[in-house]
């Protein structure tokens, strides 16, 4: 009956962690004697190829300084405890502790048997590192040029993480990769770039990080922050201002970042009705008269700049009973 070595084609281990490389001789055959078990790294330099051996009488040996005896152990193999006890070598599973990038590669598990001869199996050990992810908005100011408004960083992954963005805005991503502080790892930075305008301020975009160490992609929301000058509109005019009306108000509606620092009401004619009183963002009209037949201007200032809106007013002789709807500026 033929025997075979059962190994996994590929084993993944976490950088700094412990991994087991399974190796079993199958099937159990009466009288099949395992005289030696060895683990080798065929692709390593000649003096580092022999990684571990298990001799039925001598027990385990770990000759190479890499990985070295302090980081290697046989999980189940047992030497004979005395002259009357047979060694148990069918399970030659090898454990590697404190995984380093240099441990990655092919490992050959070999059983020297009698009378079947030598049989072997090969496993590829991949060393992976789970990256640490973070994303943050960059405080930017309104501009005509494309600017980085958010960063997503996946630190010290192996292999490098894949970063993408989920957003309805008109954007592009710029990615850079640098070596991590841990040898063999990579830090990936993705820059979410757009022409910063008020439309982007307060919008939430999502950084999506994919890595084989994650069960599912990491999704990190980021709320954009764009400093922009006030975007102004005027509301309150209902196309039914008539002489003598006393309940009229204009409101200066603003979107801005940061908050407005000042409001200024004026008219294009240069004449300002005395019965109109500016109260911050509101213009309160005590009584409409013919001087209101003009265009009112609201100018708003913030730390970035200023914005303005105009509202044309038409004063009627008598109320419009047709029920005109309110219109904005």
């Amino acid at each position: 009956q033929d025997v075979r070595v059962q190994v996994l084609p590929e084993v993944r281990g976490q950088l700094g962690g412990t991994v087991e490389l399974p190796c079993h001789l199958l099937p159990p055959v009466p009288g099949l004697y395992i005289s030696l078990v060895t683990w080798q790294r065929p692709d390593a330099p000649a003096n580092h190829q022999n990684v571990a051996a298990f001799h039925p009488k001598m027990g385990p040996s770990f000759p190479s300084p890499k990985p070295g005896s302090e980081r290697l152990s046989f999980v189940s193999a047992k030497q004979s405890t005395g002259q009357d006890t047979e060694a148990e070598l069918q399970d030659a599973t090898l454990a590697l502790h404190g995984l380093t990038v240099e441990d990655e590669g092919n490992y050959t598990c070999e059983f020297a048997t009698f009378p079947k001869g030598s049989v072997r199996g090969m496993t590829w050990l991949r060393v992976i590192a789970k990256p640490k992810n973070q994303a943050e908005a960059q405080k930017v100011t309104f501009s005509q040029d494309p600017t980085t408004v958010a960063l997503c960083i996946s630190k010290e992954g192996r292999p490098p993480a894949r970063i993408s963005w989920l957003s309805s805005l008109d954007w592009e991503a710029k990615e850079t990769q640098v070596s991590g502080t841990l040898a063999g790892t990579v830090t990936v930075t993705s820059r979410f770039t757009l022409v910063p305008s008020g439309r982007a301020d307060g919008v939430t975009v999502t950084c999506k990080v994919e890595h084989e160490s994650f069960e599912e992609p990491a999704l990190i929301p980021v709320t954009l922050s764009v400093r922009y000058p006030p975007e102004v509109s005027i509301s309150g005019y209902d196309d039914n201002w008539y002489l003598g009306r006393t309940d009229a108000t204009l409101s200066c509606d603003v979107r801005s970042n940061p908050e407005p620092t000042g409001y200024d009401w004026s008219t294009t004619s240069g004449t300002f009705p005395t019965s109109a009183v500016a109260q911050g963002s509101q213009l309160v009209i005590h009584a409409v008269d013919s001087l209101f037949n003009t265009t009112f201007v609201c100018t708003v200032t913030n730390a970035v700049g200023m914005g303005r809106a105009e509202q044309v007013i038409f004063v009627r002789e008598t109320p419009n009973t047709a029920g005109a709807g309110a219109t904005g500026g």
Partner: antibody
Framework: QVQLVQSGAEVKKPGSSVKVSCKAS????????IHWVRQPPGKGLEWIGA????????NYNQKFQGRVTITAVTSTSTAYMELSSLRSEDTAVYYC?????????WGQGTTVTVSS | DIQMTQSPSTLSASVGDRVTITCRAS??????VVWYQQKPGQPPKTLIY???YRYSGVPDRFSGSGSGTDFTLTISSLQAEDVAVYYC?????????FGQGTKLEIK
């Protein structure tokens, strides 16, 4: 401790047979193969074959196939190597040896001289 | 059968010398090679197994290397008690085969 004690020296005529014994002690006899290796005077080592006492399975070097029979008697923990149709070139020291990783335990050797 | 060819057949060296014995297999045997030392009137003793692993109790002046078809036994500083015949043996494939031996003498 493990001991392999072999039978005494033999002088045989060409064409005859010889049967050498190897009594084992100090371990579970049925768990390990007993191998036989010979060494002609002033020459190197040559593997002859082996027996597994647990099921009496045997395995031979093709060179000796048909001329050698290796057996084991579990009740006495003794292995035997019988070589027939002896010729002068079979003159050698015959060792029984126990494979524990390598040939770690050896009998003291039995000198077989084939001479007319 | 796999042939194991040792060289040299005889080697004469002085105490303190570095001595090298080579063994070439007729086909790939991996690292499945043992080196034995045999003194007159005694059975062989294991020095090295799996090509480079030193057996317990063997002085560290003995070392082995090689894989595939070419193997080396090195004695870093020859001692008088190292006078013996040295054999390589492959256990990769049945039947086990030995080299013809290297006789080491002191000058």
């Amino acid at each position: 401790q493990v001991q392999l004690v072999q039978s005494g020296a033999e002088v045989k005529k060409p064409g005859s047979s010889v049967k050498v014994s190897c009594k084992a002690s100090g371990y579970i006899f049925t768990s390990y193969w007993i191998h036989w290796v010979r060494q002609p005077p002033g020459k190197g080592l040559e593997w002859i074959g082996a027996v597994y006492p647990g099921n009496s399975d045997s395995n031979y070097n093709q060179k000796f196939q048909g001329r050698v029979t290796i057996t084991a008697v579990t009740s006495t923990s003794t292995a035997y190597m019988e070589l027939s149709s002896l010729r002068s070139e079979d003159t050698a020291v015959y060792y029984c040896t126990k494979l524990v990783g390598t040939f770690d335990y050896w009998g003291q050797g039995t000198t077989v001289t084939v001479s007319s | 059968d796999i042939q194991m060819t040792q060289s040299p057949s005889t080697l004469s060296a002085s105490v303190g010398d570095r001595v090298t014995i080579t063994c070439r297999a007729s086909q790939n045997v991996g690292i499945n090679v043992v080196w034995y030392q045999q003194k007159p009137g005694q059975p062989p003793k294991t020095l090295i197994y799996s090509a480079s692993y030193r057996y317990s109790g063997v002085p560290d002046r003995f070392s082995g290397s090689g894989s595939g078809t070419d193997f080396t036994l090195t004695i870093s500083s020859l001692q008088a008690e190292d006078v013996a015949v040295y054999y390589c043996q492959q256990y990769n494939t049945n039947p086990f085969t030995f080299g013809q031996g290297t006789k080491l003498e002191i000058k």
